[in-house]
């Protein structure tokens, strides 16, 4: 007997765009409060009836009058070929699921797309089909001609499928991958023919789970979250994205208008728990996220403002700056950094609540310092803020450092004139702009005899014409504040420099290593003085201040050049200030080869010699150090005689070499001629590392015997 | 014989707005990507806009989309183009295009339309 | 957006010779690239989809090739009906864009 409550009036339609199969039936005979748990037997199948293709129990609880509802989405499109639908039902009766007892079968139901298609001789199928990557796809033709040969392209590349009936074949392809934004194109065409249909299957990249969630706030006003999206789908256009915020304590839920973050009100009620899930979501997928956190965990402090300095001294400086109230009046911990100069010198931590105040100290005078401060929760440290910066600059103090001084003395028709130079003051020794520096002349056979001169910055030397006497000669720097300690020195009519001899160093591209011997008696300390431009009128004199047990140093320089002398001279300066020349020593910082030969005078001209001079070439001035000169002579006879030998010269000629050995001689005498003879000679000086250019020779012919002198 | 025919092409001010419609035939046009393309005098081809099957999605150039609208009425075999805020650059004979997918295998004679005070 | 520059703007060539118009596009544009006719006074054709794939009906002198982003057009023998200016277009992203043209003709 046939089961009193069977499915009837079975509805099918259908969603093509989805591929789905939407059944709508009701059972009748239920009572209208009766509640009854049934299980419905679907059966689908394709092409004909016997070719069942799904069977699926549906287990739901019925009540009287209620349309019930179940959807089947198809692998196949729906278009590609008829679906036949039934079902039956029984009483769900979950004990005993064995002993069902069956209704009939409702009679088919059948479902014919095909139907509704147009008058084309080719269909393709599914139109706009949105998968994700990594899917299994059906496609299929439909063709209105049986005598058609249909091949059908996946990019181009010809897809192997099987034929459902003579006018309809399918296709599947597997872990279909992402190419482009525009779609898969597929293409299915008539052999012999002109027919062609074109679908584009859009393969989404999947959706990825937003990562780096995370709120917070700044005011207490508004949480902020951000989250990083992950890569995009690559169907932005076709699969639009969409980001929810909900929190589950207050029940309340934001669409994000933006991919990667979104604001979120925080309650007036003083909510401090809060439990968000971030959904990212498309047509295709979900995904979600969730944080649970406490709000005043979560603080991002605004930047600090109103940085201010005040009570800004010689050395300290009170710094204050206001933070911004959350409300809560929770105390903050201000991180504050001192830079001088472009570096931290100084870090501070400050307990903060509203205002904050920090005392820097050991600071220099007239100094440009910058100072920076942050703030972050002191309980429950989240973030730092923005640093906020500002500037500031000490107060000027009198220079404290005497400027470090040197003299050149001259004697002038009776006079000395000592020119005074001074180093300008560091930045730290300045403590402020120098202005001028005072020169105070003591006259010490008269202390009462006292000049004042003021030399006004930035001037870096004096002349003083002094008769020969004794002087003791004071030079301050001054700034806005005050007056530096004095740098003190005694000038004497008679420096006494000339009886010291001068010794020879080598440098080396460190430059010159300079020793001295150490003074017996009360020193006060050493100078070494150079010039480092030594050939030009000014020189550009310098000078090395160095300790009293000091008997060595190296002095470099950027100026030093290959082939220029340097001449250095060490002074010990008595406690008395007098500075009396100890050592001179003269070297190349690179010895080069002599750049020109001695112009030579000839003279005493016989019919057996002549004599060579070159009185005014000046040793000193040459490129390294002259050890002597060569004397090259050349002859027809080509003979070398005692006292000479035989050269060979760069272009192959051959001559005689005399060779001297002291550079101070400078005379020589070419003797053992024959009258009546042509000579040529060639004078050149050598040193440690070669020899002057071999120029031109110069001609001479010696007279008979018998002519006069 | 497969067939697209475009009209509605016009002397318009700049600022002003047109209509152009397209009416298919000879094939079903509710299978198929429809397009406009448009060509200004003496220039090369542009893009302006496509409709799927159903008209559920279209897609523009960019600096069209605020002021063009593509639309489709399956029923009538008709595919329009709403143009508003006509400038002198829109000036072109605009094609109505049917799609094989994005390519395009069916072109109509084309409309012209000139935006000039 | 994605540029399609083709080369060169203009060629004359005799009879029966060889023509290749180049296509180079600014970003990879895999093989959605098609080719098209348009001969004066006329809508365009389309000759040529997914780069290398001819379409119904059209000549086989008409050929494609190419990948990534350099593409190429190839008509074997130049025919007096062949006079046009020839299009390449991408599809591979939005917006949908055309090279500038090439004009054929017969010296």
């Known amino acids: 007997e046939p089961l009193p409550w069977a499915p009837e009036s079975l509805k099918v339609s259908i969603n093509s765009t989805h591929q789905c199969l939407h059944l709508q039936w009701s059972v009748h005979n239920l009572a209208y409060h009766q509640e009854l748990k049934m299980v419905f037997q679907i059966e689908i199948s394709r092409i004909k009836t016997s070719n069942v293709i799904w069977v699926e129990n549906y287990s739901t609880t019925v009540k009287g009058n209620q349309l019930l509802h179940w959807s089947w989405e198809s692998q196949l499109p729906l278009e590609c070929a008829k679906h036949f639908i039934r079902m039956r039902s029984a009483v769900d009766d979950a004990t005993t699921p064995e002993q069902r007892f069956w209704s009939n079968w409702s009679s088919w139901e059948e479902v014919d797309v095909q139907n509704s298609l147009g008058h084309e001789p080719l269909f393709v199928f599914p139109k706009d089909k949105l998968v994700e990557e990594g899917s299994n796809v059906t496609i299929c033709y439909v063709s209105r001609s049986q005598q058609n040969n249909i091949s059908c392209y996946l990019e181009g590349v010809r897809m192997q499928g099987q034929q459902l009936d003579p006018n309809v074949s399918m296709f599947n392809l597997h872990n279909v991958a992402f190419i482009r934004e525009t779609g898969t194109n597929i293409y299915c065409k008539v052999d012999r023919g002109d027919d062609i249909k074109g679908i584009v299957l859009f393969v989404s990249k999947i959706l990825e789970e937003p990562k780096d969630f995370s709120c917070e706030t700044r005011d207490f006003q508004t949480l902020s979250c951000t989250w990083d999206p992950g890569r995009d789908t690559g169907l932005l256009k076709q699969l639009p994205q969409s980001y929810t915020l909900f929190e589950s304590f207050s029940g309340k839920k934001t669409l994000c208008k933006h991919k990667g973050w979104c604001n979120w009100q925080v309650a007036p009620e003083s909510q401090e728990m809060y439990n968000f899930t971030l959904t990212a979501e498309n047509y295709l997928r979900k995904r979600s996220v969730h944080i649970l956190f406490n709000l005043t965990h979560r603080v991002h402090p605004m930047a600090p403002f109103n940085v201010l300095f005040k009570d800004v001294s010689v050395t300290n400086a009170t710094m204050t700056w206001k933070v911004h109230s959350t409300g809560n009046y929770y105390t903050l911990l201000c991180q504050v950094e001192l830079y001088g100069e472009g570096k931290v010198i100084q870090k501070h931590n400050v307990s903060v609540k509203v205002n904050g105040e920090l005392v820097l100290s050991g600071l220099e005078p007239d100094t440009e310092y910058s100072a920076q401060v942050r703030c972050a929760n002191a309980n429950h440290f989240w973030k730092w803020s923005e640093w906020t910066r500002q500037n500031f600059t000490t107060v000027e103090a009198a220079p404290s450092e005497a400027p470090d001084v040197w003299r050149n003395v001259k004697s002038v028709q009776g006079y000395c004139v000592v020119t005074l130079f001074w180093k300008p003051l560091s930045r730290l020794q300045a403590n402020g702009e120098i202005l001028f520096y005072n020169i105070v002349v003591e006259d010490l056979d008269r202390p009462s005899g006292l000049q004042l001169l003021s030399v006004p910055a930035p001037a870096n030397r004096t002349e003083l014409t002094l008769d020969q006497r004794a002087y003791q000669i004071h030079v301050t720097a001054n700034n806005s504040v005050g007056t530096s300690p004095a740098s003190v020195l005694v000038v004497s009519g008679d420096p006494g420099d000339e009886e010291v001899e001068e010794e020879r160093v080598k440098g080396t591209e460190d430059g010159f290593s300079l020793s001295w011997k150490p003074q017996p008696g009360n020193i006060t300390g050493y100078i070494v003085e150079w010039c480092d431009r030594p050939r030009d009128p000014l020189c550009d004199l310098q000078w090395k201040h160095l300790g009293p047990n000091t008997t060595s140093t190296v002095i470099s320089s950027d100026a030093f050049r290959p082939g220029v002398r340097y001449n250095f001279r060490i002074y010990g300066i008595s406690t008395e200030m007098v500075p009396y020349l100890l050592e001179k020593k003269t070297g190349y910082s690179q010895e080069l080869a002599p750049s020109d030969n001695p112009r030579v005078v000839m003279s005493n001209l016989t019919s057996h010699s002549f004599t060579l001079s070159w009185k005014d070439y000046s040793t000193e001035s040459q490129p390294s150090f002259i050890r002597g000169y060569h004397v090259y002579l050349k002859s027809k006879a080509g003979q070398c005689h005692p006292g000479s030998e035989k050269a060979v010269l760069s272009d192959d000629s051959v001559c005689c070499k005399y060779k001297i050995d002291d550079p101070k001689q400078k005379m020589f005498v070419v003797g053992n001629l024959q009258p009546e003879s042509f000579y040529e000679f060639l004078v050149t000086p050598y040193s440690a590392v070669g020899e002057g250019p071999h120029g031109a020779f110069t001609k001479v012919t010696t007279p008979d015997e018998y002519s006069p002198m | 014989e497969v067939q697209l025919v475009e009209s509605g092409g016009d002397l318009v001010k700049p600022g002003g707005s047109l209509r152009l419609s397209c009416v298919a035939s000879g094939f079903t046009f509710s299978d198929y990507y429809m397009a406009w393309v448009r060509q200004a005098p003496g220039k090369g081809l542009q893009w302006v806009a496509n409709?799927?099957?159903?008209?559920?999605?279209?897609y523009y150039l960019d600096s069209l989309k605020s002021r063009f609208t593509i639309s489709r009425d399956n029923a009538k075999n008709t595919l329009y183009l709403q143009m508003n805020s006509l400038r002198a650059e829109d000036t072109a004979m605009y094609y109505c295009?049917?799609?094989?997918?994005?390519?395009?295998?069916?072109w109509g004679q084309g409309t012209l339309v000139t935006v000039s005070s | 957006e994605i540029v399609m520059t083709q080369s060169p703007a203009s060629l004359s060539l005799s009879q029966e010779e060889k023509v290749t118009i180049t296509c180079k596009a600014s970003?990879?544009?895999?093989?959605?690239v098609a080719w098209y006719q348009q001969k004066p006074g006329q809508a365009p054709k389309l000759l040529i989809y997914l780069a290398s794939t001819r379409h119904t009906g059209v000549p086989s002198r008409f050929s494609g090739s190419g990948s990534g982003t350099d593409f190429s057009f190839t008509i074997s023998s130049l025919e007096p009906e062949d006079v046009a200016v020839y299009y390449c277009?991408?599809?591979?992203?939005?917006?949908?864009?055309f090279g500038q043209g090439t004009k054929v003709e017969i010296k």
């Open positions: 277009q991408q599809y591979s992203r939005f917006p949908l864009t």
């Open positions: 409709i799927n099957y159903d008209g559920s999605s279209t």
């Open positions: 295009v049917r799609g094989l997918t994005w390519d395009f295998d069916v």
């Open positions: 970003q990879d544009v895999d093989t959605a």
